[in-house]
């Protein structure tokens, strides 16, 4: 089990690091988006895992961004961002087969209503219980 956890961690860390860099290979990214959405978590260790991803990085004074799958829908009443940006993207998470292009990457400011915990502990608990 320890080896499985280590392998899972390495795969997820690499998936986050390479997020959005190859529009032709998005299966792992979309799977991870789905995990974040379902487990209500963000990043592997912490949400800050996303801060080093180039495609999500703001330039200069811009806020750090995280994928929309990190967005905590139940923590906001901002209907504009929900209707126009997030819901259309999150609806896609139910249809993982559909390919995505880099222009489709949905991101929100890290200061917004995102899940506050990383996904690792939840996934590790799941592994221990199965």
């Amino acid at each position: 089990r320890a080896q499985l956890e280590r392998s899972l961690r390495d795969v997820v860390e690499k998936t986050i690091q390479k997020y959005g860099t190859n529009p032709e290979e998005t299966a792992a990214e979309e799977s991870w988006d789905y995990v974040q959405f379902q487990l209500r978590c963000c990043g592997w260790h912490y949400p800050q895992d996303w801060f080093q991803v180039l495609i999500l990085r703001g330039n200069g004074s811009e806020a750090h961004r995280v994928p929309c799958s990190c967005y905590n829908l139940s923590a906001t009443n901002d209907s504009t961002i929900l209707d126009k940006v997030i819901l259309p993207q999150l609806s896609r998470l139910g249809h993982l087969a559909r390919s995505r292009h880099s222009a489709d990457i949905c991101a929100v400011p890290a200061e917004s209503h995102i899940y506050r915990e990383g996904c690792a502990q939840g996934l590790q608990k799941w592994l221990h219980n199965n």
């Epitope: 280590r6 961690r9 390495d10 860390e13 690499k14 986050i16 690091q17 592997w44 260790h45 912490y46 949400p47 800050q48 895992d49 801060f51 080093q52 750090h64 890290a110 506050r116 990383g118 690792a120």
Partner: antibody, heavy 121, light 111 residues
Framework: QVQLVESGGGLVKPGGSLRLSCAAS????????MTWIRQAPGKGLEWVSY????????YYADFVKGRFTISRDNAKNSLYLQMNSLRAEDTAVYYC??????????????WGQGTLVTVSS | QSALTQPASVSGSPGQSITISCTGT?????????VSWYQQHPSKAPKLMIY???NRPSGVSNRFSGSKSGNTASLTISGLQAEDEADYYC???????????FGGGTKLTVL
């Protein structure tokens, strides 16, 4: 017993570079998350950088981003900090430390003795 | 300017109890239970005294205890001894890009 020994500190001119090393022993190094923390003379502790056990994920304090690079060699049980474009305000004792319990909890149970970096012309 | 606020100094007589506070925000101390406390003697490396707000590592005296209320964490040392004289630092995970924040440190003097 767990031991962390830093080396590589010294006197360097502003704009110069230095590479710090931390040799680990007494535990399975590849299982643990590691960090660099510094302390300017007479001042408090300041977190610098953090690296996952795999070495894939790295975190940096805003004041060192783009200048410092953390890395590790699990085969050699060693942690590194490459410091470029050094400034006078980087003068400090640099400690390497281990995160407790094979987790990423940012709570550090073992520290090295520190290595002094002095940036001065 | 440290992210977490600690008193610069506290003092107490042998046998007394003292408490050191550490005030942050809901983005660090108040929002998570990853608060730790370190003891540092002059020219020595810091030593972990408390982790996860209130847990003691093995080997640390039970005279040291930690707690948290809202955005403020506290370290209490009971039955003060001469060897407790040192600097004490609190630390917390933070949801900002900084990841880890420390307090400015508190110098404990045993009178």
């Amino acid at each position: 017993q767990v031991q962390l020994v830093e080396s590589g500190g010294g006197l360097v001119k502003p704009g110069g570079s230095l590479r710090l090393s931390c040799a680990a022993s007494g535990f399975t190094f590849s299982d643990y998350y590691m960090t660099w923390i510094r302390q300017a003379p007479g001042k408090g502790l300041e977190w610098v950088s953090y690296i996952s056990s795999s070495g894939i994920t790295k975190y940096y304090a805003d004041f060192v981003k783009g200048r410092f690079t953390i890395s590790r060699d699990n085969a050699k049980n060693s942690l590194y900090l490459q410091m470029n474009s050094l400034r006078a305000e980087d003068t400090a004792v640099y400690y390497c430390a281990r995160d407790r319990d094979r987790q990423w909890l940012l709570e550090f149970d073992y520290w090295g003795q520190g290595t002094l970096v002095t940036v001065s012309s | 300017q440290s992210a977490l606020t600690q008193p610069a100094s506290v003092s107490g007589s042998p046998g007394q109890s003292i408490t050191i506070s550490c005030t942050g925000t809901s983005s660090d101390v108040g929002g998570y239970n990853y608060v730790s406390w370190y003891q540092q003697h002059p020219s020595k490396a810091p030593k972990l005294m408390i982790y996860d707000v209130s847990n003691r590592p093995s080997g640390v005296s039970n005279r040291f205890s930690g707690s948290k209320s809202g955005n403020t964490a506290s370290l209490t040392i009971s039955g003060l001894q001469a060897e407790d004289e040192a600097d004490y630092y609190c630390s917390s995970y933070t949801s900002s890009s900084t990841l880890v924040v420390f307090g400015g440190g508190t110098k404990l003097t045993v009178l």
